[in-house]
């Protein structure tokens, strides 16, 4: 969380962003909230982004200006119109782009003032894993896949039952490139499977960690898929 | 840690050219818009020119307008200025800057270019 | 183009005294100027962006205020390195950018 004050001859209002991650190819949020003003005309919210000449977005009295919006941007961003009244200038970015990635502003001035806070937005692409057994293989064999993962992860298996195990000699793992040319397939395979045991698949990058889970018994398998985005700050 | 290093400066006679160049590292080149920025002997900054990061949009000042050529090369991590018809009034230190929030959050040491007969 | 008019142009201060230079856009420019200190030799240095955003590393005794046609950078207990000139610069929409003509801080 990143909490920013504004310092001028005007009075300082507070802003506050907060740290995350964009799915290149869906559509993402930056989040900024202020101390809300009585009358949307006199607020403005401008976004940037470090290092970009234009401007990523600009809302004012009531509604978008996007003349000085970067072409990087066009057609891209979007505030939360009905929220901005409330103190949310939460940006939508559509599509996101690997280039997306860096350090953007989010800059307020209302009637009680103006303020500031960063923000840090990471891109890649990152998804749930499925793990299911591998009837075709000879031996008890799980087969974890992801379909999408940006930049690549490591892989790790895990046992409830032989917890601190470790399974690199008994694991097999692939990153296949798919067509955009960006984002990779996961696939790991895990050889010599007890039954009567939960396993994990664990993926992460630095944007995100994600877990397949399985349970082989006799007479059933249970599964269970956990996403987490990492580094979610904010400031 | 960012670095920029310019190089190409050097004495030069009217109506002569040069080719500046400003190699950068230590951030991704290719996120940030670059920016030329002289000085005149005893004198003040004056802008000269920046570039997107793509390249794609060029702006100038009037005063080297349709003389000279701000260009970058991402994959080599390098600004360029390209300076024709080169006058008197050119004569200052160049320095290369990387835009952050519209200003100029790191700059190279310079070179200096100085324009006489 | 839009013009930056600096005041004064010299001003002569003890280690201690509150410094303040002012920068008057010749147009509306929003929160959109930033304050450079040079050193003889030296290239420009960041200290404040967005009219009052304080560079990372910059020291806390550099402010910046002013909104519009009107800047003010405030050196609270000036320094010995902070001996210097002091340049404004404006960065509304896109370039041509422009600087103001400069502040030199000298010791009296």
């Known amino acids: 969380l990143i909490i920013g004050f504004g310092i001028s001859g005007r009075h300082s209002i507070t802003v506050t962003t907060v740290a995350s991650a964009g799915n290149i190819g869906e559509d993402g949020i930056l989040s900024c909230t202020f101390e809300p003003d009585i009358k949307l005309s006199d607020i403005v919210i401008q976004w940037l982004k470090e290092g970009v000449l234009g401007l990523v977005h600009e809302f004012k009295e009531g509604k978008d200006e996007l003349s000085e919006q970067d072409e990087m941007f066009r057609g891209r961003t979007a505030v939360f119109a009905d929220q901005v009244i409330v103190g949310n200038a939460s940006l939508r970015l559509k599509n996101v782009q690997l280039t997306d990635a860096g350090t953007y502003k989010c800059y307020i001035i209302t009637s009680k003032g103006k303020g500031n806070a960063n923000l840090e937005y990471k891109t890649g692409a990152f998804s749930m894993p499925e793990v299911n057994v591998d009837y075709n293989a000879s031996s008890e064999t799980l087969r974890c896949e992801a379909p999408r993962w940006f930049p690549q992860p490591t892989v790790v298996w895990a046992s409830q039952v032989d917890q601190g195990a470790n399974f690199s000699e008994v694991s097999n793992t692939s990153f296949e490139l798919n067509s955009e040319n960006v984002t990779m397939k996961v696939v790991s395979v895990l050889y010599n499977v007890t039954i009567n045991n939960t396993y994990s698949c664990m993926i992460e990058n630095d944007i995100a960690k994600a877990t397949g889970d399985i349970k082989v018994t006799e007479s059933e398998i249970k599964r269970r898929s956990h996403l987490q985005l990492l580094n979610s700050k904010a400031s | 840690e960012v670095q920029l290093l310019e190089s190409g400066g050097g004495l030069v006679q009217p109506g002569g050219s040069l080719r500046l160049s400003c190699a950068a590292s230590g951030f991704t080149f290719s996120s940030y818009a670059m920016s030329w920025v002289r000085q005149a002997p005893g004198k003040g900054l004056e802008w000269v020119s920046a570039?997107?990061?793509?390249?794609?949009?060029?702006y100038y000042a009037d005063s080297v307008k349709g003389r000279f050529t701000i260009s970058r090369d991402n994959s080599k991590n390098t600004l360029y200025l390209q300076m024709n018809s080169l006058r008197a009034e050119d004569t200052a230190v160049y320095y290369c800057?990387?835009?952050?929030?519209?200003?100029?959050?790191?700059w190279g040491q310079g070179t200096t270019v100085t324009v006489s007969s | 183009d839009i013009q930056l008019t600096q005041s004064p142009s010299s001003v002569s201060a003890s280690v201690g005294d509150r410094v303040t230079i002012t920068c008057r856009a010749s147009?509306?420019?929003?929160?959109?100027l930033a304050w450079y200190q040079q050193k003889p030799g030296k290239a420009p240095k960041l200290l404040i962006y967005a009219a009052s955003s304080l560079q990372s590393g910059v020291p806390s005794r550099f402010s910046g205020s002013g909104s519009g046609t009107d800047f003010t950078l405030t050196i609270s207990s000036l320094q010995p390195e902070d001996f210097a000139t002091y340049y404004c610069?404006?960065?509304?929409?896109?370039?041509?950018?422009?600087f103001g003509g400069g502040t030199k801080v000298e010791i009296k």
């Open positions: 570039i997107s990061g793509s390249g794609g949009s060029t």
């Open positions: 147009q509306d420019i929003s929160s959109w």
């Open positions: 610069q404006q960065a509304t929409s896109y370039p041509p950018w422009t």
């Open positions: 800057a990387r835009v952050g929030f519209r200003a100029l959050n790191y």
